[in-house]
């Protein structure tokens, strides 16, 4: 498990937004399970992090991401509903430097080394489609979430509107 | 641009069903929350239930049990159903839309004008 | 479900003067926290969403801070028309629960 150093136990609200979607409106640390309740770990394995799915040991310590919240508009010619829209949009960060991307070509979540101005595929659309559960589409793949697949994450493909709420793409997020 | 717009009767018989519905315009249900609040008269504002934009919902746990929120996209609506009524369930009833796309983190920026709706018989 | 819990449920203040109101959850919500003006008879008006952040067409003098657990909203120079009942609301978790409120009239 990673500490993240300088990152306040609680959220941080920050006051420097001028721009939208360029400072974070808020960061907060948490460990990310499923909706099964396993836990998202990462590991260093030959000098690359891997994640994991997996149950942990009774009093084994859930790993922390930082997660950084933006706030997009989202122009009204996109939204279809004819009013300039706003989204919440994440970044997740297990450890200092690196990040959670997505790699739509080969369906995969990895983590990246890199500076800001992150990446548009380290973004994702924040989603509440049940109760106390998020879940995490890609910005630059519309439809495409963060999920579960063989003990590992993926990128999974949602068809439609009823299948936003299947277990495999719902996470829950807490402060132990 | 945004509206919501509450209808339903305004008089309900203790121990029936107070049924509302709430009409919307300028945005999709399938992209925002939407969600029902009351306000008895004179009192705060109490929570009823959402229906989120992937069509689950949640409900407030002290009405639960009594409460179901459905939606028509067809017709741009959502509506509440509340079961075995009393004196109590007399009060103003809203809707109000989240302020995020996909999401209550921003809480509810539009609102209805509200309903009145009395329990008695 | 978390509570939330506001102080004082009232306060009697003249025009210009600083106002400050206080919610305080039962458990912590990061920053998912939102603060509402109602005026009798009318819908409630969001103020300020995700605990600090201004809505659209909201004068400045209104202002929130904190995260966690304990949440402030400042009214900087009370006008005329901020004579209302404000309420904040938890959005970190479902059920969205309301404080009790908080009325502001003229001293």
């Known amino acids: 498990a990673f500490g993240i150093s300088g990152v306040q136990k609680y959220t941080r609200a920050l006051h420097d937004s001028s721009i939208t979607g360029i400072s974070p409106i808020t960061e907060y640390l948490a460990s990310l399970s499923t909706y099964n309740d396993q836990s998202i770990t990462f590991a260093l394995e030959d000098e690359s992090y891997e994640i994991y799915v997996e149950d942990l040991k009774k009093d084994e310590k859930k790993d922390k991401v930082l997660l950084s919240y933006y706030e997009s508009q989202h122009p009204s010619n996109e939204s279809g509903d004819g009013v300039d829209g706003k989204m919440l949009m994440v970044t997740l960060s297990p450890t200092k430097d690196f990040w959670l991307h997505a790699n739509n070509k080969e369906h995969s979540v990895e983590l990246h080394k890199c500076e800001k101005p992150l990446p548009d595929q380290a973004f994702f659309v924040l989603h509440n489609m049940h109760s106390n559960c998020v879940s995490f589409e890609c910005k630059t793949d519309p439809g495409v979430f963060i999920g579960v697949k063989d003990n590992h994450l993926a990128l999974i493909k949602v068809d439609s509107s009823e299948n936003l709420c299947t277990e495999n793409i719902l996470f829950k997020l807490s402060e132990t | 641009q945004v509206q919501l717009q509450e209808s339903g009767p305004g008089l309900v018989k203790p121990s029936e069903t107070l049924s509302l519905t709430c009409t919307v315009s300028?945005?999709?249900?399938?992209?925002?929350?939407v969600h029902w609040i009351r306000q008895p008269p004179g009192k705060g504002l109490e929570w009823i239930g959402v229906l989120r934009a992937g069509g689950s919902t949640g409900y407030n746990s002290a009405l639960m049990s009594r409460v179901t929120i459905s939606v028509d996209t067809s017709k741009n609506q959502f509506s509440l159903k509340l079961s075995s009524v009393t004196a109590a369930d007399t009060a103003v009833y809203y809707c109000?839309?989240?302020?995020?796309?996909?999401?209550?983190?921003?809480?509810?920026?539009?609102w209805g004008q509200g309903t009145l709706v009395t329990v008695s018989s | 479900d978390i509570q939330m819990t506001q102080s004082p449920s009232s306060v009697s203040a003249s025009v210009g003067d600083r106002v400050t109101i206080t919610c305080l959850a039962s458990q912590t919500i990061g920053a998912w926290l939102a603060w509402y003006q109602q005026k009798p008879g009318k819908s409630p008006k969001l103020l300020i969403y995700a605990a600090t952040r201004l809505a659209d067409g909201v004068p400045s003098r209104f202002s929130g801070s904190g995260s966690g657990t304990d949440f402030t909203l400042t009214i900087s120079s009370l006008q005329p028309e901020d004579f209302a009942t404000y309420y904040c609301q938890q959005l970190d978790s479902s059920p969205y629960t309301f404080g009790q409120g908080t009325k502001v009239e003229i001293k």
């Open positions: 109000a839309r989240d302020h995020y796309y996909y999401s209550s983190y921003g809480g509810f920026v539009y």
């Open positions: 300028g945005f999709s249900l399938s992209k925002y929350g």
